[in-house]
Interface confidence: medium
Amino acid sequence: TERLCHPCPWEWTFFQGNCYFMSNSQRNWHDSITACKEVGAQLVVIKSAEEQNFLQLQSSRSNRFTWMGLSDLNQEGTWQWVDGSPLLPSFKQYWNRGEPNNVGEEDCAEFSGNGWNDDKCNLAKFWICKKSAASCSRDEEQFLSPAPATPNPPPAGSGGGLNDIFEAQKIEWHEHHHHHH
């Protein structure tokens, strides 16, 4: 039996100390927030250029329009993350050409192609949840058998432990039972 540290739940991706869940179903922006909250996460709030590059790549590779936790719902033209933090000046460069354009009440931000776009919040899109990776103290180490020893940091998408499995199942259950048109 190996003692392994798995910082992220099954089906989640590890990057720079955080875990990310890229949905396989679609929800509107508000329901995407709820989906993330239900698994102890948050609709993704981007904190660095490296994180943005990583997430943009995931989104563009899969060719999906994907919600992030950014909107100007509180005040038109003032973009704010779901954690209450403002959009930093350097992040404005991620908007696609001519965006945000607020055509027809477009108040929520999505990954679109190589940058960001604003779109109507009631549209169903894929979403990304983010939460801190497990610290992997001795009490949190999981027993998995058999398994090879993993290098540090563990590979993306690795996971382990009953809590992780339940969380992954919870996401899967919601994805199969919530249909938004």
């Epitope: 250029a49 490296e50 350097s90 696609n96």
Partner: antibody, heavy 122, light 106 residues
Framework: QVTLRESGPALVKPTQTLTLTCTFS??????????VSWIRQPPGKALEWLAL???????YYSTSLKTRLTISKDTSKNQVVLTMTNMDPVDTATYYC??????????????WGRGTLVTVSS | DIQLTQSPSTLSASVGDRVTITCRAS??????LAWYQQKPGKAPKLLIY???SLESGVPSRFTGSGSGTEFTLTISSLQPDDFATYYC????????FGQGTKVEIK
């Protein structure tokens, strides 16, 4: 054709307020992603970014000079104005305005004015 | 604030030489870096943006590379028109310039 042109006094006295105007053509500061910035260069020295104003009227200032600077825009006139208070001889420099393009490749400066030399002396 | 340090400050080279200028950032700026060329009495001219993207109309002998904290501008074969001062500029967090590298005739 896109152009930017700086205008303002060539000479100001110490403690006075400097007002510079950037008049541009070929683009609109109401277009998403477009910004106009002020950058200066003392004689024989490096470039120093001063201030930037976005299409949505967000304003950003150099941390070391923010108490002295004010940037504003008049979209209808295609102008951006910079005021700098309490001028000192060390503020003698060529002052440039420059444009930040629209798009998701970053907020660099793709087009510059020719610059205007401002001398601070009594 | 993010500081940019260019090296060398001055570079003596001949026509046809391969020239490399380095720019180091005080913290990671991903690939949000631009390079400019400036000639005496003239405004800076954009050469490279996003660390390695060549601005339209700029000769292909200019190439940019790097990410994170270390970046380079390379001129593959120096031409008479290339003797100038070169500046790097970051736009990851506000905007700052390097102190410049003067490329002069050897």
């Amino acid at each position: 054709q896109v152009t930017l042109r700086e205008s303002g006094p060539a000479l100001v006295k110490p403690t006075q307020t400097l007002t510079l105007t950037c008049t541009f053509s070929g683009f609109s500061l109401s277009t998403s992603g477009i910004s106009v910035s002020w950058i200066r260069q003392p004689p024989g020295k490096a470039l120093e970014w001063l201030a930037l104003i976005d299409w949505d009227d967000d304003k950003y200032y150099s941390t070391s000079l923010k108490t002295r600077l004010t940037i504003s825009k008049d979209t209808s006139k295609n102008q951006v104005v910079l005021t700098m208070t309490n001028m000192d001889p060390v503020d003698t420099a060529t002052y440039y305005c420059a444009r930040t393009p629209s798009g998701s490749y970053g907020r660099y400066f793709d087009l510059w004015g020719r610059g205007t030399l401002v001398t601070v002396s009594s | 604030d993010i500081q940019l340090t260019q090296s060398p400050s001055t570079l003596s080279a001949s026509v046809g030489d391969r020239v490399t200028i380095t720019c180091r950032a005080s913290q990671s700026i991903s690939n949000w870096l631009a390079w400019y060329q400036q000639k005496p009495g003239k405004a800076p001219k954009l050469l490279i943006y996003k660390a390695s993207s060549l601005e339209s109309g700029v000769p292909s002998r200019f190439t940019g590379s790097g990410s994170g904290t270390e970046f380079t501008l390379t001129i593959s074969s120096l031409q008479p028109d290339d003797f100038a001062t070169y500046y790097c500029q970051q736009y990851n967090s506000y905007w700052t310039f390097g102190q410049g590298t003067k490329v002069e005739i050897k």
